[in-house]
């Protein structure tokens, strides 16, 4: 017959024949023949191989690093790579998650639009009209004014994006 | 470990059939193709038959061809050669090897045939 | 067919020198399929070399294997004394036959 130009998934064309391909977890060790399958071995510990593969050498597991701020997240399989989180206060500096950096906060003025996770950094969004904000803080929302009104009082200092607003006691010597 | 061990070597008359077994042990047996290579005394080697891992192809050397059947029972781990009709010129040491694409990696220690009267 | 004719027949040298043995082929062997094998009295063939040139595993790195096409050559390049014995090469790509050559020995000289 003549030799295949193309195999099926799964299988992989080395000198004109057809090889199954290694399952995930597995290397490759010897290709087939016409008379023996495709010769696969275990990956070691710490390594992996996510794919149907030919790969001759596993990959090694990421290493959570504790001095660039990495912890282990999930621990890696024979077929799946070690995921990396940061420590709490960090987050990730990219999708690898490679290093950690503090989380930002958010200065006076503005407050936490959304709380940093391990993967993604604090989000500010500045204190609109009627809200502020008056530390520095990766927590904190902006807060309302207070409503004087509602205390029977008067506003004596408006607020700002950074400040309150002061309420007083009523002027009672009003014609 | 990986080994391979040949057994069913002796003295046969010429005309007279003969079975050898191969026991397998330290790898899969079911996935690999198996050979057989004899040697006769003071020669070279010569490759003799080939069976693939399920049984289903079988490719024999001519000069055994309609005499030798090459066989496998993977659930006891073991490949056989039937020889019959054996011949003065039969007599050698048979080794069974595996089959990879390095050629044939693990051998067997060899059994003796002798074809006498 | 594919006829394997190795030279020379026998190789007489002392331990330390160069060993080069060859190996041609009747027809160009496809894929480098060529095997070397090491054979000392009383026992099995081992693979040495496959693939022409790929070292088999536990093999010492004395020995190398080059060619191709028609024509293979097996090195060991400081003979020790366990390397004397008798060297074969066989053809895997075109069969049947599996063909082995004639055999090189390799005696202390």
């Known amino acids: 017959p003549e030799p295949p130009t193309a195999c099926r998934e799964k299988q992989y064309l080395i000198n004109s024949q057809c090889c199954s391909l290694c399952q995930p977890g597995q290397k490759l060790v010897s290709d087939c023949t016409e008379f023996t399958e495709t010769e696969c071995l275990p990956c070691g510990e710490s390594e992996f191989l996510d794919t149907w593969n030919r790969e001759t050498h596993c990959h090694q597991h990421k290493y959570c690093d504790p001095n660039l701020g990495l912890r282990v997240q999930q621990k890696g399989t024979s077929e799946t790579d070690t995921i990396c989180t940061c420590e709490e206060g960090w987050h990730c500096t990219s999708e690898a998650c490679e290093s950690c950096v503090l989380h930002r906060s958010c200065s006076p003025g503005f407050g936490v639009k959304q709380i940093a996770t391990g993967v993604s950094d604090t989000i500010c969004e500045p204190c609109p009209v009627g809200f502020f904000s008056n530390v520095s803080s990766a927590f904190e929302k902006c807060h309302p004014w207070t409503s004087c009104e509602t205390k029977d009082l008067v506003v004596q200092q408006a607020g700002t994006n950074k400040t309150d607003v002061v309420c007083g006691p009523q002027d009672r010597l009003r014609a | 470990q990986v080994q391979l061990v040949e057994s069913g070597g002796g003295v046969v008359q010429p005309g007279r059939s003969l079975r050898l077994s191969c026991a397998a042990s330290?790898?899969?047996?079911?996935?690999?193709?198996m050979h057989w290579v004899r040697q006769a005394p003071g020669k070279g080697l010569e490759w003799v038959a080939v069976?693939?891992?399920?049984?289903?192809?079988?490719y024999y050397a001519e000069s055994v061809k309609g005499r030798f059947t090459i066989s496998r029972d993977n659930s006891k781990n073991t490949l056989y050669l039937q020889m019959n009709s054996l011949r003065a010129e039969d007599t050698a040491v048979y080794y069974c090897?595996?089959?990879?694409?390095?050629?044939?990696?693990?051998w067997g220690q060899g059994t003796m045939v002798t074809v006498s009267s | 067919e594919i006829v394997l004719t190795q030279s020379p027949g026998t190789l007489s040298l002392s331990p330390g020198e160069r060993a080069t043995l060859s190996c041609r082929a009747s027809?160009?062997?496809?894929?480098?399929?060529l095997a070397w094998y090491q054979q000392k009295p009383g026992q099995a063939p081992r693979l040495l070399i496959y693939?022409?040139?790929s070292l088999a595993t536990g093999i010492p790195d004395r020995f190398s294997g080059s060619g191709s096409g028609t024509d293979f050559t097996l090195t060991i390049s400081r003979l020790e004394p366990e390397d004397f014995a008798v060297y074969y090469c066989?053809?895997?790509?075109?069969?049947?036959?599996?063909?082995f050559g004639g055999g090189t020995k390799v005696e202390i000289k």
């Open positions: 027809q160009s062997v496809s894929y480098s399929y």
């Open positions: 069976i693939s891992y399920e049984g289903t192809k079988k």
């Open positions: 693939g022409a040139s």
């Open positions: 090897a595996r089959d990879t694409s390095r050629g044939h990696d693990i």
């Open positions: 066989q053809q895997y790509s075109d069969y049947p036959p599996f063909t």
């Open positions: 330290g790898f899969t047996f079911e996935k690999y193709g």
